[in-house]
């Protein structure tokens, strides 16, 4: 998906009313200095890729995040404000039922929502470059 | 099952307000927005506005911008939308309809309509 | 806004017809277009969504297909309670909108 069009205003809004609140939650009792961010990204759409395939797409040490409270927000922002995100997610929402939930909060999963939290305000921080 | 109950039917004179209630159940209110349209007499369907509980925020149709107004209240499972401002044209029935924004992505399920009359 | 234009107005047929609807959108839409039937005195109700996905409880003579700017609903053969207008809306991008209608009458 190409988020060139996006509303990064509106995304923005939410992340700083409600999503960025959801992810710390997550990560307490670690410290910002537990992790080094590895991932990063160069401007809004390329962002909101990086930060789509972090919470979204599962990994061998951290299987899904996306049944998580910051994930379903951050779904739910996207296909708002993206123009025509909503119907790429038909297909991987069947997909995503059928996986079983296996909810344990690993150390890979904190460094993955660390890395989360990074390009999230990287996001912020490319958005005031560009006002 | 998902219900959709909305308040009743309202007659109101011009210049007043109107709050139109949409009382949800049988699903998880958080997991779907609540979109507001609207239908004049003999017309189409005209898409007001959505507040996403989730999310806990709102957008309006700009034709409705600082006229309409969209809450919900999370304890209850019940939305809002409220009109000021009212002139004859916004006689019409309203509907409120659910709409996943995690999945399904369409305007599934839809209240059985609140009709009202502006009228002096 | 994204503007949908529906044809055509009225279509009168017989049951047992096929009838076929048009919804053409003013910019190219992948296919975020879904379709209701609203009968007088009722809500719409949800017939196909994302163009050609059926629901379930909707019987299988009522079709979707298309994408980019053109869409159709197909009927394959028209029953007495299939006498409706009917509605495309996309949810492409906010504001989400509506077409502008077709009644389908008994000829």
């Known amino acids: 998906y190409d988020f060139t069009n996006c509303d990064f205003q509106k995304i923005e809004a939410d992340y700083l009313r409600t999503i960025s609140k959801d992810l710390i939650t997550y990560m307490s009792g670690t410290k910002s200095t537990d992790f080094n961010n590895t991932v990063s990204c160069s401007n809004r759409p390329h962002c909101l890729t990086e930060i789509q395939s972090l919470t979204f797409n599962p990994t061998p040490r951290c299987a899904s995040l996306a049944k998580e409270m910051f994930a379903r927000k951050t779904k739910a922002t996207l296909a708002l404000w993206c123009p025509g995100y909503s119907e790429t997610q038909i297909n991987a929402t069947q997909a995503m039922k059928k996986r079983r939930k296996r909810k344990v909060t690993t150390n890979k999963c904190l460094e993955q929502v660390s890395q989360l939290l990074g390009l999230w305000r990287r996001f912020i921080r490319t958005l005031l470059k560009k006002q | 099952q998902v219900q959709l109950v909305q308040s009743g039917d309202e007659v109101k004179k011009p210049g007043s307000s109107v709050k139109v209630s949409c009382k949800a159940s049988g699903y998880i209110f958080t997991d779907y927005a609540m979109h507001w349209v609207r239908q004049r007499p003999g017309q189409g369907l005209e898409w007001m506005g959505t507040?996403?509980?989730?999310?806990?925020?709102?957008d309006y149709n700009q034709n409705f911008k600082g006229r309409a107004t969209i809450t919900a209240d999370k304890s209850t499972s019940t939305a809002y939308m409220e009109l000021s401002s009212l002139r004859s044209e916004d006689t019409a029935v309203y509907y409120c309809?659910?709409?996943?924004?995690?999945?399904?992505?369409?305007?599934?399920?839809w209240g059985q309509g609140t009709s009202v009359t502006v009228s002096s | 806004e994204i503007v949908l234009t529906q044809s055509p107005g009225t279509l009168s047929l017989s049951p047992g017809e096929r009838a076929t609807l048009s919804c053409r959108a003013s910019q190219p839409i992948s296919i975020s277009v879904h379709w209701y039937q609203q009968k007088p005195g009722e809500a719409p109700r949800l017939l196909i969504y994302?163009?050609?996905q059926s629901i379930s409880g909707i019987p299988d003579r009522f079709s979707g297909s298309g994408s980019g700017t053109d869409f159709t609903l197909t009927i394959s053969r028209l029953e007495s309670e299939d006498f409706a207008v009917y509605y495309c809306q996309q949810t492409f991008s906010l504001p989400y909108t509506f077409g502008t209608g077709t009644k389908v009458e008994i000829k």
């Open positions: 507040f996403i509980p989730l999310l806990d925020t709102s």
């Open positions: 309809a659910r709409m996943g924004v995690t999945h399904s992505y369409v305007m599934d399920a």
């Open positions: 994302f163009a050609s």
